[in-house]
């Protein structure tokens, strides 16, 4: 795991501690909170980023209708348990022994229970719908220009191959970005859609995770695209298991 060689920092994760103690005196970076080594050429997993965040000091195209099984992250921040690869453990518990099951993006997918709760496997989130509303502009953006710009952004900034950007829908002022990725589709080095969506979400909120890079400056044919609202829906390969009580 190496980082930028000249100044020992991690370009893709500012929530790291870096030092030239890798093999041959090379720069090595470790995530805050977990102390896990991270690969600074790619995105850090959302689990490690959430853990680092909790440890840091506090400061005519029709739009897609999310399915009834779509999850929204209403629980907010928590200090997650990550596996040795930096992925979310299927079962998460808080300090008061309240436990719940999460999907691969760390969003709760069951009712909360006690320590006896079993989460047999980490269920993969294979479809993410990013719903954006942009600020008023002189005219609507050209849809194909918007599509191309967002694909370029996800490849260059988040390293997500365009094959995983399934569609970009646009009905002014709403933009929807659909990310799709089955477990079998991921090849060596491919970024996870959950990690890309999290970096994008933080960029949109003006909380960039990148080191020393400017904030997100999104332009479509020179026209700034300023987002005023974001909603992210997560669809899992297996539907979530909530009791009827939650739905009323």
């Amino acid at each position: 795991h190496t980082a930028a060689q000249d100044n020992c920092t991690c370009p893709t994760n500012k929530m790291t501690v870096c030092s030239p103690d890798g093999p041959g005196g090379r720069c090595q970076c470790r995530a805050l909170g977990s102390g896990m080594a991270v690969d600074c050429s790619t995105l850090t997993s959302k689990c490690l980023l959430l853990k680092a965040r909790m440890s840091a000091p506090k400061n005519a195209r029709t739009l897609v209708r999310p399915s009834e099984h779509a999850l929204v992250d209403n629980d907010g921040l928590y200090d997650p348990d990550c596996d040795p690869e930096g992925r979310f453990k299927a079962r998460q518990c808080n300090q008061t022994s309240v436990c719940w099951c999460v999907n691969s993006v760390g969003v709760r997918r069951t009712d909360k229970g006690d320590l006896s709760l079993r989460c047999d496997e980490l269920v993969r989130t294979h479809h993410i719908l990013i719903d954006l509303r942009h600020r008023p502009t002189a005219g609507a953006f050209n849809h194909s220009d918007l599509d191309a710009e967002l694909r370029r952004l996800f490849r260059e900034r988040y390293r997500l191959h365009p094959k995983f950007v399934a569609a970009v829908h646009y009905e002014q002022p709403t933009i929807q970005i659909e990310l799709r990725q089955n477990t079998s589709q991921k090849a060596a080095g491919d970024v996870d859609i959950g990690d890309a969506a999290y970096y994008f979400e933080r960029d949109i909120k003006g909380e960039s995770l990148f080191q020393g890079r400017g904030g997100l400056d999104l332009r479509v044919r020179g026209e700034p695209l300023q987002v005023e609202r974001t909603l992210i829906y997560y669809l899992d390969e297996i539907p979530p298991k909530f009791s009827m009580k939650r739905l009323t």
């Epitope: 190496t2 090849a187 080095g189």
Partner: antibody, heavy 119, light 108 residues
Framework: QVQLVQSGAEVKKPGASVKVSCKAS????????MHWVRQAPGQGLEWMGE????????SYAQKFKGRVTITRDTSTSTAYMELSSLRSEDTAVYYC????????????WGQGTLVTVSS | DIQMTQSPSSLSASVGDRVTITCRAS??????LNWYQQKPGKAPKLLIY???RLQSGVPSRFSGSGSGTDFTLTISSLQPEDFATYFC??????????FGQGTKLEIK
């Protein structure tokens, strides 16, 4: 060890098609991108296209769109590159190469297949 | 498409020399720059990926540096087997992934 073994040299007439094969071994075929790169005699390297064997996704360089088709057979761990409407300037050595999704570096290459287009 | 320009296009050097080859991208490519070595009649061989990471099995006399648009491949002490053609390649943006035109390293 990782190996990519390509089919033998081909001589084709202008307007014909050629299909080059690339058999992978020593790794899980569906876990890596496969790319095709060509090199005209005495010239540089030119990227043609890519495929993910797991789901048959392909993308091609604009220059070759409509003429090139990359396919795969997961049962034999083999990738194929077919180039149609051949012309003399397609005379080149064609390489398959295993790729990494993030760096887009090509860490293992086939030995190359010389395709000669001549009337 | 991103253009990659190598310099020089050819150079002569002696065994033991320190040699530097440069590669310039037509736009910022961060650190997504790879270097290959090719010998006559053979397939290219990956030397360095992500600007400075040495591919497994490649001798430590090869090193890479740079960021953004300007990159360098350095061979600290030339060995007889290093005389070959070297190519840079970017993997930053959407396809196509582009190569430099090559630098031929010859024996002086």
């Amino acid at each position: 060890q990782v190996q990519l073994v390509q089919s033998g040299a081909e001589v084709k007439k202008p307007g014909a098609s050629v299909k080059v094969s690339c058999k992978a071994s020593g790794y899980t075929f569906t876990s890596y991108w496969m790319h095709w790169v060509r090199q005209a005699p005495g010239q540089g390297l030119e990227w043609m296209g890519e495929i993910t064997p797991s789901d048959n996704y392909t993308s091609y360089a604009q220059k070759f769109k409509g003429r090139v088709t990359i396919t795969r057979d997961t049962s034999t761990s083999t990738a194929y590159m077919e180039l149609s409407s051949l012309r003399s300037e397609d005379t080149a050595v064609y390489y398959c190469a295993r790729g990494h999704g993030n760096y887009v570096s090509f860490d293992y290459w086939g030995q190359g297949t010389l395709v000669t287009v001549s009337s | 498409d991103i253009q990659m320009t190598q310099s020089p296009s050819s150079l002569s050097a002696s065994v033991g020399d320190r040699v530097t080859i440069t590669c310039r991208a037509s736009q910022d490519i961060s650190n997504y720059l790879n270097w290959y070595q090719q010998k006559p009649g053979k397939a290219p061989k990956l030397l360095i990926y992500y600007t400075s990471r040495l591919q497994s099995g490649v001798p430590s006399r090869f090193s890479g540096s740079g960021s953004g648009t300007d990159f360098t491949l350095t061979i600290s002490s030339l060995q007889p087997e290093d005389f070959a053609t070297y190519f840079c390649q970017q993997g930053y943006t959407l396809p196509p992934y582009t190569f430099g035109q090559g630098t031929k390293l010859e024996i002086k």
